[in-house]
Interface confidence: low
């Protein structure tokens, strides 16, 4: 595929990445799939600066990110190492709370109203943020 050098329409460029901010809600898996169909992934937060950028754009609204522990350990969807990477959990989080009555614990991470992170039931219909890196190979065929 061709190399993407600028962001798609309605995406926001920042630090050589492109971001798309939803204004509707989906379950985490549906949001994850949406981003993948856009040749992107749910946002992966690698620095405090990126955290603040995303926070600035989403405002005080619960919003999914590309972090989950549905298979055991916490993992970023793009393979970024969780243990050594940036984290911004709320106090006492993640807690894998079972008391919500929806079955199971809490396996998906989202930005809360103050930007810090919480784990929640993956089926909740939250907004989401997609991210794709500039300069990576696009799956779209080159324009002739």
């Amino acid at each position: 595929g061709s190399e993407r050098t600028c962001c798609p329409v309605n995406w926001v460029e920042h630090e050589r990445s492109c971001y798309w901010f939803s204004r509707s809600g989906k379950a985490w898996a549906d949001a994850d799939n949406y981003c993948r169909l856009e040749d992107a992934h749910l946002v992966v937060v690698t620095s405090w600066e990126e955290q603040k950028f995303v926070q600035h754009h989403i405002g005080p609204v619960n919003t999914w990110m590309g972090l989950h522990d549905q298979n055991g350990p916490w993992k970023w969807v793009d393979g970024t190492d969780y243990e050594t990477g940036f984290k911004n959990w709320r106090p006492e989080q993640p807690d894998d709370w079972y008391g919500h009555g929806l079955g199971g614990g809490e396996d998906c991470a989202h930005f809360t109203d103050d930007g810090r992170w919480n784990d929640d039931v993956c089926q909740r219909p939250y907004r989401w943020v997609c991210e794709t890196e500039l300069d990576k190979a696009s799956q779209e065929p080159p324009l002739l």
């Epitope: 630090e15 620095s47 600066e49 603040k52 600035h56 709320r90």
Partner: antibody
Framework: QVQLVESGGGVVQPGRSLRLSCAAS????????MHWVRQAPGKGLEWVAV????????YHADSVKGRFTISRDNSKNTLYLQMNSLRAEDTAMYYC??????????????????WGQGTTVTVSS | EIVMTQSPATLSVSPGERATLSCRAS??????LAWFQQKPGQAPRLLIY???IRATGIPARFSGSGSGTEFTLTIYSLQSEDFAVYYC??????????FGGGTKVEIK
């Protein structure tokens, strides 16, 4: 007026502990992130640690990780640095500084805009 | 860790002249850079944040510019009180927050 005053420095033997304090006045302490920054004699500035406005998050430099702990008591308008297992290389002037970028309200207005005058820590046998 | 490199280490300037200080980051820090001034026996003082935004009370003769990896602090028409050590500091990728080694601006 806005002021930060450090205390608790002194001469201490290697391996011993010390707790620094930073008393804040003239502003809403609980709305600001706070840092400790140190400066060895004749050297440049070295960031030591940061704590969020509400104490919920804190980070330490690798050089002090596992030995130093930053904390705060918003009811007392005071920032702390607990220093354990002190080494000769920890000898420095220690400054506290506030930073709105890690505060309650302003996400983009970064900058250590108010500093204390510092407290001297000397680690020597 | 992002390494900040300042040059020159010492800059000799006459009062009234312009001083140009450089700061280079080992990788991009966007515009997330601050400049501090420190006089002997005193705490550092914030001059610039966001690469070019003057902090409260800082005179207009202090000007910051740059983005990415290359930054400049320009002091126009140096006053006697401007002779000091100047540090740059990045807050883009951390921990750790990192400072440059400093540039001493001395009287020529």
């Amino acid at each position: 007026q806005v002021q930060l005053v450090e205390s608790g420095g002194g001469v201490v033997q290697p391996g011993r502990s010390l707790r620094l304090s930073c008393a804040a006045s003239g502003f809403t302490f609980s709305s600001y992130g706070m840092h400790w920054v140190r400066q060895a004699p004749g050297k440049g500035l070295e960031w030591v640690a940061v704590i969020w406005y509400d104490g919920s998050n804190k980070y330490h430099a690798d050089s002090v990780k596992g030995r130093f702990t930053i904390s705060r008591d918003n009811s007392k308008n005071t920032l702390y640095l607990q220093m354990n297992s002190l080494r000769a290389e920890d000898t420095a002037m220690y400054y506290c500084a506030r930073d709105e970028g890690f505060g309650e309200f302003d996400y983009y207005n970064y900058g250590m805009d108010v500093w204390g005058q510092g407290t001297t820590v000397t680690v020597s046998s | 860790e992002i390494v900040m490199t300042q040059s020159p280490a010492t800059l000799s300037v006459s009062p009234g002249e312009r001083a140009t200080l450089s700061c280079r980051a080992s990788q991009s820090v966007s515009r997330n850079l601050a400049w501090f001034q420190q006089k002997p026996g005193q705490a550092p003082r914030l001059l610039i944040y966001g690469a070019s935004i003057r902090a409260t009370g800082i005179p207009a003769r202090f000007s910051g510019s740059g983005s990415g990896t290359e930054f400049t602090l320009t002091i126009y028409s140096l006053q006697s009180e401007d002779f000091a050590v100047y540090y740059c500091q990045q807050y883009n990728n951390w921990p750790p927050l990192t400072f440059g080694g400093g540039t001493k601006v001395e009287i020529k």
